[in-house]
């Protein structure tokens, strides 16, 4: 099934610079069980919460999120407006973090790129994608090489000479990526709550985080748990204006109910321990 | 178990301010907002607003704005809720909640005569 | 905002007996994106602070009885209580999870005839 991973994506609206959107989504097999979206960092590392999602419960917003709604079963969006003369979104990081049962939480941030024109960005994929002004620069190239090679496949052909093994001219995304990014991996282990896992907090070594609040006193039976397989996320998507990281994150830490069984028996938020193993704390 | 505790009644003359408050335990206070709801005497419903502790970020009902400022210290995980210029139809039971209004404290009776 | 309208105002049913309530929203509570309705259904106690039934338009929340079922999209939801029991006597509401500001019926009292 392959290792979830997130995307996001923020765009300026052409009609008016001060709204932005962010885009975010998740692609992976499991079912999502809440959306945490904050700005100035990941949640509970110094990002400040613009909104939360739940799948039936609903959505709830604080200022300057406008908007908050599902796109679809794994996607949302929020509208924020910016009331300032200058933009602070311009040069903001969001992030998203998708509680899903029973991968746990996955975080990924990006922000607005520097040079993006308004209503120019596309709209979020969900396959991995390279940045458009990349994947142009790269396509003269590779037409440009392609060409070259020809030629001097000619040109060896009439001096009767063997032809050459040309190297061919390809950067996948996960190059692109190591340039920006430092490449994520999450290592998890098991609690006694089968649906729980612990996580080694990845962000992107762009951003200056911290591991959240309360690693410490997660409850002591955490710590004789059998190791679980370390899980290596998959090659991040780039996208205009976005970047993909991955977090297997402390269910409990997702916080969130597993879809299907009520409310009463969601884990808990923030890293801080499951309540009794059936935690669920005021979200809004 | 996550509790929700509120304060105890009060009886308020017309033109005066009360403030209840809702201790939290059992969870993570910061996470998650603390919503306020109150119900007047054989009345329904009426959703007056929400805190995001960590933050303190706000949302009012516009019925309320003006009149209601919601705190929380996250020290003690205790929300406040602090209704203005009072009224004898502000008389109500005041509820804090959390979750989706899935947990409910045990409501806060605010009488106000004069 | 949003209008919850539930009807009846009260009901009197038999013990063992199907209640049915109803609620209309002025707005639909159906999100399009991901097809869900954004509905909840709370049962109060006299005395005792509202409780979360249903979710989601149907969704039953932990530890509430199957007897009790939600149904509806849009605009027009029931709440139904298969097999009434006596401890099911309580005001019943319906409440707006779609949007700003959340927003509740007016209650239904469920007796018992």
């Known amino acids: 099934a392959g290792t979830p991973e997130v995307w996001v994506q923020v765009q300026m609206e052409a009609t008016e610079l001060s709204s932005f959107t962010v885009h975010c989504g998740f692609l992976g097999p499991g079912s999502i069980s809440l959306v945490t979206v904050s700005w100035g960092g990941p949640d509970g590392a110094g990002g400040t919460k613009l909104a939360v999602l739940h799948p039936e419960l609903g959505t709830r917003q604080w200022a300057p999120a406008r908007q908050a709604r599902w796109e679809t079963q794994s996607s949302i969006s929020l509208a924020l407006e910016d009331s300032g003369a200058s933009s602070p979104f311009a040069n903001t990081t969001f992030c998203c973090k998708f509680a899903s049962f029973p991968e746990g939480s996955w975080e990924s941030c990006g922000s607005l790129p520097p040079s993006s024109d308004p209503g120019l960005s596309a709209p979020p994929t969900p396959v991995p994608i390279l940045r458009a002004d990349l994947a142009g620069i790269l396509g003269l190239s590779g037409v440009l090489l392609f060409g070259c090679g020809y030629l001097l496949h000619l040109l060896r052909r009439q001096k009767h000479r063997p032809t050459p093994r040309l190297q061919p001219s390809h950067t996948n995304s996960q190059a692109l990526t190591a340039q920006a990014w430092a490449p994520s991996q999450a290592s998890q282990a098991a609690l006694h709550d089968p649906y729980a896992t612990i996580n080694t907090s990845f962000c992107p070594a762009t951003l200056d985080t911290a591991h959240p609040n309360g690693w410490a006193s997660l409850p002591t039976h955490a710590a004789h748990q059998p190791q679980g397989p370390a899980a290596s996320a998959s090659t991040p998507i780039l996208a205009r204006g976005s970047f993909v990281s991955v977090e297997n994150g402390l269910y409990t830490q997702a916080g969130e109910r597993p879809p299907h069984t009520g409310p009463g028996l969601t884990l808990f938020p923030d890293c801080r321990g499951p309540r009794a193993l059936e935690g669920r704390f005021g979200v809004r | 178990e996550v509790q929700l505790v509120q304060s105890g009644a009060e009886v308020k003359k017309p033109g005066s301010s009360v403030k209840v408050s809702c201790k939290a335990s059992?969870?993570?206070?910061?996470?998650?907002?603390i919503e306020w709801v109150r119900q007047a005497p054989g009345q329904g419903l009426e959703w007056i607003g929400e805190i995001l502790p960590g933050s303190n970020s706000t949302n009012y009902n516009e019925k309320f704005k003006g009149r209601v400022t919601f705190t929380a210290d996250t020290s003690t995980n205790t929300a406040y809720m602090e209704l203005s210029s009072l009224r004898s139809e502000d008389t109500a039971v005041y509820y804090c909640s959390s979750y989706w209004f899935a947990y409910w404290g045990q409501g806060t009776l605010v009488t106000v005569s004069s | 905002d949003i209008v919850m309208t539930q009807s009846p105002d009260s009901l009197a049913v038999s013990l063992g007996e199907r209640a049915t309530i109803n609620c209309k929203s002025s707005?639909?509570?159906?999100?399009?994106?991901?097809?869900?309705?954004?509905l909840a259904w709370y049962q109060q106690k006299p005395g005792q602070p509202p409780k979360l039934l249903i979710y989601?338009?149907?969704t039953r929340e932990s530890g509430v009885p199957d007897r009790f079922s939600g149904s509806g999209s849009g605009t027009d939801f029931t709440l139904t209580i298969s097999s009434l029991q006596a401890e099911d006597v309580a005001v019943y509401y319906c409440q707006n999870a779609h949007s700003y500001p959340p927003t509740f019926g007016q209650g239904t009292k469920l007796e018992i005839k």
């Open positions: 059992g969870g993570t206070f910061s996470s998650f907002s």
């Open positions: 989601g338009a149907s």
């Open positions: 707005q639909s509570l159906l999100n399009s994106g991901n097809q869900k309705n954004y």
